[in-house]
């Protein structure tokens, strides 16, 4: 007999994992057997849909791969002509372990300002979201919070917030964790300690200090008088992002110099100044120590001989040191003019290196004496007939004045640098000239007092200023 | 040739004093600058003090104030007194002769500071 | 004062073969008006006195052997041992006499296989 369709066990609520396999059973009793059909939404699942298998005539329907979008109500109508259709509806509830859909970036931030980390995520049940700092769980605090998007918010960030972030998805069928992003937090170039005025002595060697910090860490330029430093010697050090600068300067006028402390945010700088006074005080007696000051030579008759910039010893046993040393030169050079072309040079080299001494700078100034090797070389080899002359003249009164006595050094007296290297000076001219003393012909038949030892090659033999001493 | 020979260590205690000295011979002694250097059992070599040919002198921050480096040109003789000694001083005292290098070094003398 | 930090802080090596020790110093230690480096090399072996070996950064002193040599400038310095042979075996400072407190290198000991 006909029979009009029953529904014998309706459709119920269908939980199921993205691409997993979730099927709805629609059972039905007729007769003659129904045509059955579905749909979700409300919208008809044809049959020839690639995605879905329907079997057992109709009351089988199988999802083949669940994706998130098949979330819905899913209905059955069961129709045989006899009697009215019947339906039969149930939800398919897609559940999604948690998924990280657009996670957090590497950041960059200028501390103060407002940054946020995105962590925007999908997953049913809804996950929750959390962040981890380092290896530890992030706390939330009045400037710190986690948005209702899972986003990370950081109000006022401070040098402190800096580090490495990630964020975790979590719901009950697992968790997702983001990739590490680094937030750097970046700080406005800041001087913290200012180069300080001073008021010195013309010939003094000063040192302005600067200090500076930011992130990533300043870079210190020196201008003096609004333009770049063109003299001194600049020492730099860089601990725990602050960069200290010490600028070394002669004194030989007066001068604004000014610190800038300079660091780059993406295309933008940040720039920090402070500058300082230096002038020059009169000239006041120096210390009981203190023989003398450091000065760059600016005299005329020994520019050719002393190393381009040379620091030398200025006496201040002499009332106007430059003057008196220039003055001792130029007449110990007016004598020089009638000797042999083979002592002149030599002669001229141990006038000037004697009477402008080569200087150590340092909280006492000292001169750097000749080494005595070079003076012998003078005196016995480049110019032994007119030292004896010289010393003959010496001795029987025939010079002036002492000034000249002064002029020549004692060789005797000087360090040597077969004892210590570091103690004297050499001079470059000497070796030079000593390449040629084999085409000279022997200037003295007597033996020389004192075995000349090799003069070391020029590559060895620049202009030594020895370097400071520092007291403190 | 250049010969340094330093004497006047020994055992001394705590925030006692010792007084060092070095006889150069074979060079000039008074053109040169002088130093002392020390080196404590199994360590390295640490500098304490350097004299300029006028008698300036210099010191490391570490013995700054206890030690006092002097020289006397006419007996060639350079000194280092070593005043208010502790543990931490024990260490061979090494006399050396150099300006900005360290040339010509004694064999060294033995301090000991323990109770 | 003054850092110098040498390394490595030991090395092993066989007869013959080229040992390189680095000294770095927290600051420059040449001058402006000279460009001279104010670095030191020193030799001590086992139970002597020090020996200065490179003064002026690449200067070699009197009466060292060719194969020890200095090359450096500012605040990175080198000390080379072409060749290094039996005798040399010792501990090597580094030392810089540009600004007092004058101040060493932690040393660097070079052992023979």
């Known amino acids: 007999l006909p029979k009009a369709p029953v529904i014998t066990t309706p459709l119920e609520t269908v939980d199921a994992l993205v691409e997993e396999v979730a099927t709805f059973m629609c059972a039905v009793e007729s007769y003659p057997q129904p045509e059955i059909s579905w749909t979700r939404n409300k919208i008809l699942i044809k049959l020839f849909d690639t995605r879905y298998s329907i079997r057992e005539n109709g009351q089988l329907l199988t999802i083949l791969s669940v994706e998130d979008s098949d979330d819905g109500i899913y209905c059955c109508t069961a129709n045989n002509g006899v009697g009215g259709a019947v339906e039969s509806c149930g939800a398919l509830q897609v559940k999604m372990k948690p998924k990280i859909t657009r996670p957090p970036i590497n950041v960059k931030i200028i501390e103060g300002l407002k940054a946020v980390l995105p962590c925007t995520t999908m997953g049913n049940p809804k996950p929750s979201v959390s962040w981890i700092k380092g290896d530890s769980p992030l706390r939330e605090n009045s400037r710190i919070a986690v948005l209702e998007s899972g986003s990370l918010r950081i109000h006022n960030v401070q040098k402190e917030d800096a580090g490495q972030y990630r964020c975790v998805a979590k719901n009950s069928l697992g968790t997702a964790y983001s990739k590490v992003v680094k937030l750097e937090v970046e700080v406005f170039a800041r001087i913290l300690r200012a180069p300080e005025s001073h008021n010195v002595t013309f010939g003094s060697f000063v040192t302005l200090h600067c200090t500076a910090t930011g992130i990533p860490v300043p870079t210190i330029t020196w201008i003096e008088n609004g333009n770049a430093v063109s003299s001194g010697s600049i020492q730099e050090s860089v601990k725990d992002r602050v960069i200290d600068s010490r600028l070394q300067l002669f004194i030989t006028k007066p001068g604004l110099y000014t610190c800038i402390a300079t660091n780059k945010h993406g295309e933008k700088f940040s720039t920090a100044k402070a500058a300082a006074t230096i002038s020059i005080a009169e000239w006041s007696k120096p210390q009981k120590d203190n023989k003398g000051y450091c000065a760059q030579y600016r005299g005329e008759v020994c520019n050719a001989v002393l190393a381009k910039d040379a620091l030398v010893f200025l006496n201040t046993s002499y009332a106007d040191p430059e003057e008196a040393q220039e003055l001792l030169v130029h007449t110990a050079w007016n004598e020089l003019k009638v000797v042999s072309p083979v002592c002149r040079p030599a002669a001229e080299a141990l006038l000037c290196n004697h009477i402008f001494q080569e200087c150590s700078p340092g909280v006492v100034p000292t001169p750097i004496p000749i080494c005595r090797e070079y003076c012998l070389a003078v005196k016995e080899l480049f110019c032994a007939k007119e030292w004896l002359v010289m010393e003959e003249k010496t001795h029987r009164g025939l010079y002036r004045s002492e000034m000249h006595l002064l002029s020549v050094p004692e060789c005797s007296k000087l360090p040597s640098m077969h004892w210590d290297p570091t103690a004297c000076a050499r001079l470059p001219h000497l070796d030079y000239n000593k390449e040629n003393l084999k085409t000279f012909p022997p200037m003295t038949s007597s033996k020389p007092s004192v075995d000349i030892p090799n003069l070391p090659s020029s590559s060895s033999s620049s202009f030594s200023v020895s370097p400071t001493y520092s007291m403190t | 040739e250049v010969q340094l020979v330093e004497s006047g260590g020994g055992l001394v205690q705590p925030g006692g004093s010792l007084s060092l000295s070095c006889v150069a011979s074979g060079f000039t002694f008074s053109l040169y600058y002088m130093n002392w250097v020390r080196q404590a059992p199994g360590k390295g070599l640490e500098w304490l003090s350097v004299?300029?040919?006028?008698?300036?002198?210099y010191y490391a921050d570490s013995v700054k104030g206890r030690f006092t480096i002097s020289r006397d040109n006419v007996k060639n003789t350079l000194y280092l007194q070593l005043n208010n000694l502790k543990p931490e001083d024990t260490a061979l005292y090494y006399c050396?002769?150099?300006?900005?290098?360290?040339?010509?070094w004694g064999q060294g003398t033995q301090v000991t500071v323990s109770s | 004062e003054i850092v110098l930090t040498q390394s490595p802080n030991s090395v092993t090596a066989s007869v013959g073969e080229k040992v390189t020790i680095n000294c770095k110093s927290s600051q420059r230690v040449q001058l402006g008006s000279n460009q001279k480096s104010y670095l030191n090399w020193y030799q001590q072996r086992p139970g002597q006195s020090p020996r200065l070996l490179i003064y002026y950064a690449s200067t070699q002193q009197s009466g060292i052997p060719d194969r020890f040599s200095g090359s450096g400038s500012a605040t990175d310095f080198t000390l080379t041992i072409n060749s290094v042979q039996p005798e040399d075996a010792a501990v090597y400072y580094c030392?810089?006499?540009?600004?007092?407190?004058?101040?060493f290198g932690q040393g660097t000991k070079v052992e023979l296989k």
């Open positions: 004299i300029d040919t006028h008698s300036i002198a």
């Open positions: 030392q810089q006499g540009y600004s007092a407190p004058f101040t």
């Open positions: 050396v002769l150099g300006r900005t290098a360290l040339v010509r």
